[in-house]
Interface confidence: low
């Protein structure tokens, strides 16, 4: 139904009084500068707020910061600046919060110019207490926690040293010099690149990739001639310079760098780049930049080895290295991704895939929307989504698309309806089925967030004027109520809710401005009394994901299986609750050729689902390097799509061929690797 407050909208009874009793204001005794907010742990209610204020003096900049702590989801805050000895905290390092529910926090302090090293404040009790520690180095990066053990930290120094602590920052040891980039892998492994000659920049393309599995006691060189490296899912990628020219290629390892294979991806030149768009334990989406300053490239999807790639999407919008791409993983439905393409006429269009990059289509036009001026045909057009690129271009888009794994099927995004993205003021659209169908949810740009696993959606209008009104919906954005949370409007700066969308609290941040001063203020609203009762079985309904034709036996089959979810009925106004777990029932589907990708040396002719041998490779030695060794590759031409669970049905059996291969790239072969110990 169309948004609004017509008769069809069941209004929540007495919501003003209920919300007024649950609205908590906190005025911060602070001059307005910058504010950063971090949640400490999951479901703990602990929030840390760091405010900083710079006073530019004639000779130097004087900085002041304050630290506040809440343990009730932001309803009340306590000034705990004295716990960090009133020290000025460097905001560029942020607040380093430990993984999971470790309760660990590291703050990096500003120190005076002549000091021997930096200073950190450490807490391991959810910021109730802090310990000051002076460092034997000046940090260049934020402290990085090992995902497996929150006592293990690593940091790079301004002198390019790699420093490790095994006791949560109490004691530090430099384990390697001349380090450019370092990352934690699995099992407390550290991967890092080193330079030999002058600097990271000078040695780009001649770096070495190292690994230590024992926090610096011993090392192994696992790659040379490295340009860069990255981790994604269970894959380790290295971009390696070719022997003869300035091109480079991607090599991939699934055993922490012991053995490498050359990815069957195009090589790139000096001005081009590779980018891992998304990765999981099954596969990876890889963007390969086009030659020249085109602003686009090609998306490839990998097989389960990360070696064989299928072209997924042409003309994928991605500006220069480290630039902007709209590629978005829709986390509320398996297999769904949204991104933008740059068409021949330089307009930008949104594409969506429901099957992990197998096929891409335009987004269906919302039923309650008209095609805008970009549409050639006023009856036929698509929805186009504003994401990172639009935000970078300073369009009136306050937020990127939003989805949450536990709010099944819900996607919220700014968009326009036409033949391409429009520069006009966008509206907010919602999908409740993972992107198959869309409805205009709110007129004009808004900030939005999902609470109680989708039971409540909250929005605030994006305006340059002070605001005092919040909107909320209990039926997935069909109907909206408005609530005035304060008499005195504030200059709005952001909405904050606990990550994971399980909370029923929302904090509205902003500042008040008077003739003399401006102060930070937050309003935390608890919606628990709006959703008065806990949801029961009758409040949920069965929903088949990816359903497009209920009469078709294969309806809902994506990557070899279909999933039925129990979803909250739109008409039910009740609490999913913090312990809500998504209930889903998978059913295995029959295999079809769509469940297979073509193996190396094979391709799919257009509009054909069969894999045929590439004519140019018939009878040739193939440029295919598996684990860096000369060996036969046997294939039947098909390989199951990563993560595909189909059974029975079509089983493509082909004559097994020996694809003779030579290793044209063996910079990463095992015999070139070496080890050393400290």
């Amino acid at each position: 139904s169309a948004p609004g407050e017509d008769e069809e909208c069941g209004r929540v009874r007495d919501f003003v009084a209920k919300l007024a009793n649950n609205t908590h204001q906190h005025v911060f005794d602070d001059l307005r500068g910058s504010v950063s907010l971090s949640w400490v742990g999951d479901s703990t209610g602990v929030i840390l707020v760091l405010t900083t204020f710079h006073v530019p003096l004639v000779i130097m900049t004087f900085g002041q910061s304050k630290l506040y702590r809440s343990e009730d989801y932001g309803k009340n805050f306590k000034d705990i600046t004295d716990l960090i000895n009133n020290t000025f905290i460097r905001t560029e390092f942020g607040m380093a919060i430990g993984p999971e529910n470790s309760g660990k926090v590291v703050l990096t302090a500003e120190v005076s110019g002549g000091s021997r090293g930096g200073r950190i404040f450490r807490s391991s009790d959810f910021a109730k207490n802090f310990v000051q520690t002076d460092l034997p180095f000046h940090p260049l990066t934020q402290m990085m926690y090992s995902p497996q053990n929150s006592d293990y930290l690593l940091a790079l120094s301004t002198e390019n040293g790699l420093w490790v602590s095994k006791n949560f920052g109490g004691k530090w040891e430099e384990i390697h010099k001349a380090v450019c980039l370092a990352k934690w892998g699995s099992d407390n492994t550290i991967f890092f690149t080193t330079y030999a000659n002058g600097s990271c920049k000078a040695d780009l393309g001649a770096l070495e990739l190292w690994r230590t599995s024992d926090l610096g006691k011993s090392f192994k060189t696992i790659g040379v001639k490295i340009y860069s490296f990255g981790l994604g899912g269970r894959f380790l990628f290295a971009s390696v310079m070719a022997d003869k020219d300035t091109t480079r290629r991607i090599h991939v390892s699934t055993d922490q760098g012991d053995t490498w294979s050359m990815a069957q991806l195009p090589s790139v030149g000096q001005e081009q780049f590779y980018s891992i768009l998304a990765a999981n334990d099954d596969m990876v989406f890889m963007h390969v930049d086009e030659p020249g300053d085109t602003g686009f490239g090609t998306i490839f999807t990998s097989d389960d080895r990360g070696i064989v790639y299928s072209k997924s999407l042409d003309r994928h919008l991605y500006t220069t290295t480290g630039g902007e791409t709209d590629f978005t993983n829709v986390t509320s439905l398996r297999g769904v991704y949204i991104t933008s393409v740059l068409s021949e006429d330089n307009s930008i269009q949104t594409m969506i895939t429901f099957d992990q990059g197998g096929r891409w289509t335009h987004l269906r036009k919302p039923e309650n929307s008209e095609c805008d001026a970009t549409a050639k045909n006023k009856n036929e057009c698509s929805l186009h989504i504003h994401a990172s690129y639009s935000i970078s271009q300073k369009l009136n888009v306050p937020m990127a698309p939003l989805s949450e794994p536990n709010a099944v099927g819900i996607v919220i995004a700014h968009g326009s309806v036409g033949d391409a993205i429009s520069v006009m003021v966008p509206d907010v659209y919602i999908s409740d089925d993972g992107g198959y169908s869309w409805t205009k949810m709110l007129e004009g740009p808004h900030y939005y967030t999902i609470l109680d696993s989708g039971g409540i959606i909250v929005a605030i209008e994006h305006s340059s004027r002070p605001i005092n009104v919040i909107k909320f919906s209990t039926d997935e954005g069909q109907c909206w109520q408005t609530y005035t949370f304060t008499r005195d409007p504030i200059y709005f700066t952001g909405l904050a809710s606990e990550p994971g969308a399980r909370s029923m609290n929302i904090s509205i941040w902003g500042f008040t401005e008077s003739f003399l001063t401006s102060q930070w203020v937050s309003y935390t609203i608890d919606f628990k009394d709006i959703l008065e009762r806990n949801c029961e079985e009758k409040d949920y309904t069965i929903w088949l994901a990816h359903s497009t034709d209920p009469e078709d036996y294969e309806d809902g089959c994506i990557l070899g299986y279909k999933e039925q979810f129990l979803r909250l009925r739109k008409s039910s106004v009740c609490q999913n609750g913090r312990d809500y777990v998504v209930t889903k029932q998978p059913s295995i589907c029959l295999c079809s050729l769509e469940d297979f990708l073509c193996d190396f040396g094979y391709y799919r002719p257009e509009n054909d689902s069969k894999c045929v041998e590439q004519p140019e490779l018939k009878g040739h030695d193939l440029e295919f390097c598996l684990y860096g060794r000369e060996e036969h590759l046997t294939t039947n031409g098909y390989r199951k799509i990563p993560g595909d669970k189909c059974q029975g049905g079509v089983n493509p059996v082909r004559e097994v061929k020996d694809l003779k291969k030579k290793c044209t790239s063996n910079f990463l072969s095992p015999e070139k690797q070496n080890s050393k110990s400290n």
Epitope: E551, G556, K584, S587, S592, G648
Partner: antibody, heavy 118, light 107 residues
Amino acid sequence: EVQLVESGGDLVKPGGSLKLSCAAPGFTFSTYGMSWVRQTPDKRLEWVAIISSGGSYTYYSDTVKGRFTISRDNAKNTLYLQMSSLKSEDTAMYYCSRSSSHWYFDVWGTGTTVTVSS
Amino acid sequence: DILMTQSPSSMSVSLGDTVSITCHASQGISSNIGWLQQKPGKSFKGLIYHGTNLKDGVPSRFSGSGSGADFSLTISSLESEDFADYFCVQYAQFPYTFGGGTKLEKR
């Protein structure tokens, strides 16, 4: 009205073959998956095979795999079950049943009797 | 294969009674279960799908409940046309499997 009518059941010797048909007037046959289910003399039900709406995909129970073939002719609105290498344990009343993604045994036929005996 | 254990195999009941038939799946099947009715000498009729959903045209005295591995079909206020055999069927995964059936007989 949706109806399914099976035919082709007969008395056949072990090792013999038989082809069952299921006529499906009254609905858009080509948009539904179809199953064969049999009911043994002791009234137990056993799912035999399924075929997708377009006929591209088939799946069989282990007891009939390699011996039975399910197929369909959407132009004729007819479902088939080709049975070969028949055994005495294949003796049953055979029903065809309409499937959809939401409900696999939606509408049933009246059944046809297959007896395998020497 | 998923084994569907249906009980009781038969029961004697009177008009107006409320009866419950249960089915236990050997592994979790969420709500992927249906209930069928077979009248003597006749074919089958679908009653309930997805565990709890009543098929169009089926009287509201029939209801289904349960999810995971334990399910039941309840007939409240039994009528004369309800004396029949009832079967559960799981369609969570291949091969689809049926319960052994429950015969409702007149007391």
